[in-house]
Interface confidence: low
């Protein structure tokens, strides 16, 4: 089951909103044309590990440090950017890091939002992908984020790794995988309604930066945290809806939903379970992808400490991380107990799924995601999981 989780916070909500799992992708284009517009389809799309949270949560949980475009090392434009490793060591980013399947286009956005069109069915691994024997495939996967997915995806992107869920396991043709790196979390009318209350969220703006956080929940895309049920079902993994960096949005809620602890992965660590339960990633030689996490949006404060990222220029920030002399922490750093700390150092697990955190000058935190033969990760914080497995019901 392609257990791909939505990459950015908004991604989840809009991933596979509405295409029947059995239909082939309407368009196998692998360009990242932009977030799909939500649709009111009732198709049962879920991603393994998808949860039922909303995009808002996704943003919150993923501590969605969203804002300006985020970069992927494998996309042109990164060149030999110098990055600071989490430890402070400078590392040169490779000019080009091949994407695992070369299915992703450039991620420098925000791109124009394409009109929503009927999306296609679950994507399959691209040619060259190795498929594990069907016997190793799970019959079902976690649905963690399934309910927070957005509407139908645009042709250029196809469903976000949703996949039919029940029945026998059959590898799909390796030509349908549609790799989408972000979702705008648009509602059925193409507006970012689900992100409306997120700090610095685009609201009803039609041009949103890439964002997505926890079961935000789409919750199913919310994809990132945990849910995936269905009939012609598909689920697709999502990232945590609750990343613990923004608790303010939940202040209305009972403390039951409050995110505790200062680590990005806490009780709401909806990381994007995908693939067969208990099945680890492939054993192939790991490769990786880079994702710059634009530290332009303010992050809510972390319980127990005052941590915040500065908002984009011109945007009001709720928790501007300003230093004693009134200056802000630079990109990729957050104010913590009076000093500016690298998010990479402050949050050891900032990059999910074993990704490596780096700081890129003027860009901010950057995650280098792991990739192996049968499973790889992507998303701003490697919160999305993609596998070569696809279960057909």
């Amino acid at each position: 089951v392609p257990a791909r989780e939505a990459g950015s916070a908004v991604e989840a909500e809009e991933l596979v909103k509405g295409s029947p799992a059995w239909e082939p992708p309407a368009n196998d284009t692998r360009e990242e044309a932009g977030p799909p517009a939500a649709g009111e389809d009732e198709a049962s799309w879920t991603a393994p590990g998808g949860e039922l949270a909303g995009p808002e949560e996704v943003l919150q949980e993923s501590a969605a440090v969203t804002g300006t475009a985020w970069l992927e090392a494998d996309s042109p434009g990164l060149g030999g950017v110098t990055a600071e490793a989490g430890s402070g060591d400078a590392q040169a980013l490779p000019a080009t890091l091949q994407a695992p399947h070369e299915v992703l286009g450039q991620s420098i956005m925000p791109p124009a939002i394409p009109e929503a069109t009927e999306a296609s069915g679950p994507p399959s691994p691209t040619p060259g992908d190795k498929l594990s024997p069907a016997s190793e495939l799970p019959k079902e996967s976690p649905l963690e984020v399934w309910l927070n997915l957005g509407g139908s995806t645009p042709d250029p992107q196809g469903p976000e790794l949703t996949y039919p869920f029940q029945g026998t396991l059959e590898p799909q043709p390796a030509s349908d995988i549609i790799d989408i790196d972000y979702f705008e979390g648009l509602d059925g009318e193409g507006r970012g309604a689900d992100l409306g209350s997120f700090p610095g969220s685009p609201g009803t703006s039609e041009n949103h930066p890439d964002t997505e956080g926890e079961t935000p929940s789409w919750s199913l895309l919310d994809l990132y945290d945990d849910f995936t049920p269905f009939d012609e079902s598909d689920f697709y993994p999502t990232t945590s809806f609750y990343d613990d960096l923004d608790e303010e949005e939940e202040e209305e809620e009972d403390d039951k939903d409050a995110v505790g602890g200062g680590d990005l992965e806490d009780e709401n660590e909806l990381l994007v379970p995908t693939g067969k339960p208990g099945l680890g990633p492939g054993t192939g030689q790991p490769t990786s992808r880079w994702h710059a996490v634009p530290p332009q949006h303010t992050l809510g404060s972390v319980p127990g400490s005052s941590i915040a990222l500065r908002p984009r220029p011109g945007e009001p920030g709720r928790d501007l991380a300003s230093s004693e002399n009134g200056t802000e922490c630079r990109s990729g750093f957050v104010r913590h107990n009076g000093s500016c700390r690298s998010v990479c150092d402050l949050f050891p697990s900032y990059c999910h799924n074993g990704g490596q955190c780096y700081l890129v000058e003027n860009i901010g935190a950057f995650c280098r995601c792991n990739t192996q033969d049968y499973i790889w990760h992507k998303g701003m914080r490697c919160e999305s999981i993609i596998t070569d497995f696809q279960v057909m019901c």
Epitope: E13, E57, S141, N148, F227
Partner: antibody, heavy 118, light 113 residues
Framework: EVQLLESGGGLVQPGGSLRLSCAAS????????MSWVRQAPGKGLEWVSA????????YYADSVKGRFTISRDNSKNTLYLQMNSLRAEDTAVYYC???????????WGQGTLVTVSS | DIVMTQSPDSLAVSLGERATINCKSS????????????LAWYQQKPGQPPKLLIY???TRESGVPDRFSGSGSGTDFTLTISSLQAEDVAVYYC?????????FGQGTKVEIK
């Protein structure tokens, strides 16, 4: 305080229709997926349907697919369950539940009883 | 669908004693990608809606007394009430939250001996 209040239950004949509502308060409704879970008298729990925070994605148990429709109005913080072609086996207390990202139901309404009988 | 089977169907325990409920899933609900078991436990008292006690097999929901604990991984899980209190009399359900449809165990009724 998170509160969920279901309404719309009642007695209906087989083949009839009913629309349940769930008014939510105390949390950012549009940020959470919501579900309907039912419990037949003296029986266990059965997940019925779920909907994403935006309402763009919906999910159903096979037993109700094609007959029930889940929807939500985020402007009214209200969740709905339109039930058509009701059968005797649909008789149950229907609960709306706030759904965590990991798909666990952390808040439940008090439930509304739906009785399908001739 | 993943079938959840609880045992025993009913349990009578003396106040202050330990109560143990088992839950078995027909297939693993453990996801190696995040090492999480997608299993939740609920408590339902007569005339009331269920209440979430545990999720991810062992994480207690906020406000749940620490006498309730969850354990297990893969397909076998256990809910333990370390010292049964009168207010713990209820029916307990396990639920897998890994795949759709979400499914519950048939329930275990806990009473005071």
């Amino acid at each position: 305080e998170v509160q969920l209040l279901e309404s719309g239950g009642g007695l209906v004949q087989p083949g009839g229709s009913l629309r349940l509502s769930c008014a939510a308060s105390g949390f950012t409704f549009s940020s959470y997926a919501m579900s309907w879970v039912r419990q037949a008298p003296g029986k266990g729990l059965e997940w019925v349907s779920a909907i994403s925070g935006s309402g763009g994605s919906t999910y159903y148990a096979d037993s109700v697919k094609g007959r029930f429709t889940i929807s939500r109005d985020n402007s009214k913080n209200t969740l709905y369950l339109q039930m058509n072609s009701l059968r005797a086996e649909d008789t149950a207390v229907y609960y709306c539940a706030k759904t965590k990202p990991n798909n666990a139901f952390d808040y439940w309404g008090q439930g509304t009883l739906v009785t399908v009988s001739s | 669908d993943i079938v959840m089977t609880q045992s025993p169907d009913s349990l009578a325990v003396s106040l202050g004693e330990r109560a143990t409920i088992n839950c078995k899933s027909s297939q693993s609900v453990l996801y190696s990608s995040n090492n999480k078991n997608y299993l939740a436990w609920y408590q339902q008292k007569p005339g009331q809606p269920p209440k979430l006690l545990i999720y991810w097999a062992s994480t207690r929901e906020s406000g749940v007394p620490d006498r309730f604990s969850g354990s297990g991984s893969g397909t076998d899980f256990t809910l333990t009430i370390s010292s049964l209190q009168a207010e713990d009399v209820a029916v307990y359900y396990c639920q897998q939250t890994a795949t759709q449809p979400l499914t519950f165990g048939q329930g275990t009724k806990v009473e005071i001996k």
